[in-house]
């Protein structure tokens, strides 16, 4: 049976280039090992933004050089993507894989459209 993954349709990044959204999955079984991947889709090309594998009940840990951070609570993952610029505007898809125990399940969200607006540079002050 398919695993449903829910995520918000639209998120606006902060002026500091930070966007946060929740990725929630309806687990068909009692998974103990879960992998969460954030994918970016642009012009039908899909690329990986970041990924983390975590054990249920433990914290979600991305690699040190990752632009993502996150926390997990049950079947819900709170994801934060940092360092975004206007050119990074696009559709960010949450992919969830229940790796263990069997059976394996794959869940693909519909994607969150993240809008990033570069802040206007501060005008030079005469004072």
């Amino acid at each position: 049976k398919a695993m449903h993954v829910a995520q918000p349709a639209v998120v606006l990044a902060s002026s500091r280039g930070i966007a946060s959204f929740v990725c929630e999955y309806a687990s068909p079984g009692k998974a103990t090992e879960v992998r969460v991947t954030v994918l970016r889709q642009a012009d039908s090309q899909v690329t990986e933004v970041c990924a983390a594998t975590y054990m249920m009940g433990n914290e979600l840990t991305f690699l040190d050089d990752s632009i993502c951070t996150g926390t997990s609570s049950g079947n819900q993952v709170n994801l934060t993507i940092q360092g975004l610029r206007a050119m990074d505007t696009g559709l960010y898809i949450c992919k969830v894989e229940l790796m263990y125990p069997p059976p394996y399940y794959l869940g693909i969200g519909n994607g969150t459209q993240i809008y990033v607006i570069d802040p206007e540079p501060c005008p030079d002050s005469d004072f």
């Epitope: 049976k1 398919a2 695993m3 449903h4 068909p28 090992e33 992998r35 991947t37 994918l39 899909v46 690329t47 990986e48 990924a51 594998t53 898809i93 992919k95 790796m99 263990y100 069997p102 059976p103 394996y104 399940y105 794959l106 869940g107 693909i108």
Partner: antibody
Framework: QVQLVESGGGVVQPGRSLRLSCAAS????????MHWVRQAPGKGLEWVTF????????YYCDSVKGRFTISRDNSKNTLYLQMNSLRAEDTAIYYC???????????WGQGTLVTVSS | EIVLTQSPGTLSLSPGERATLSCRAS???????LAWYQQKPGQAPRLLIY???SRATGIPDRFSGSGSGTDFTLTISRLEPEDFAVYYC?????????FGQGTKVEIK
Amino acid sequence: QVQLVESGGGVVQPGRSLRLSCAASGFTFSSYTMHWVRQAPGKGLEWVTFISYDGNNKYYCDSVKGRFTISRDNSKNTLYLQMNSLRAEDTAIYYCARTGWLGPFDYWGQGTLVTVSS
Amino acid sequence: EIVLTQSPGTLSLSPGERATLSCRASQSVGSSYLAWYQQKPGQAPRLLIYGAFSRATGIPDRFSGSGSGTDFTLTISRLEPEDFAVYYCQQYGSSPWTFGQGTKVEIK
């Protein structure tokens, strides 16, 4: 460009062993899960086994469970299939396949033929 | 295990005609997890459609996929000589990964 090249096939007697390899290039191997799929002569496609990114999680079809072992060496960009206690019904072309970001098998090797016969 | 049943087993058509291939699942498959592959003699399978209706890179727009739940369709709007091959559907939403038995599209 993405390339998957299988090797190690051949003719083997029932009960014997064989080890297949799949050399991957053109992509970050450790970022993808991988599969072996086989096709008996004149028949359809049959999924055989799956391995996770780090090699910690493995799944097998019922007909090979306990006889076949999938493994990977991310430092060598290579996928393996150790086949033990081979049977005549294991005769097939064996393909390695990459799982695309959204789940389908987006790239396949050219296949290697395994013939189990006395 | 999700069993996929393809029909018809063989489709005899002429170039320029429309081909409609069916894939029925034994239980509901999310449309995000259904793919179609093309295989020509002596070649490896090639991904055509994923997510039930998204074309893979480089696949011409005469190939289209549709369906949801348990019933899926691959349509080739106008057959070209190079389209005569065997087509397989596959579900990849849960293990074991399963394929249909294939539909052969042959020249009439």
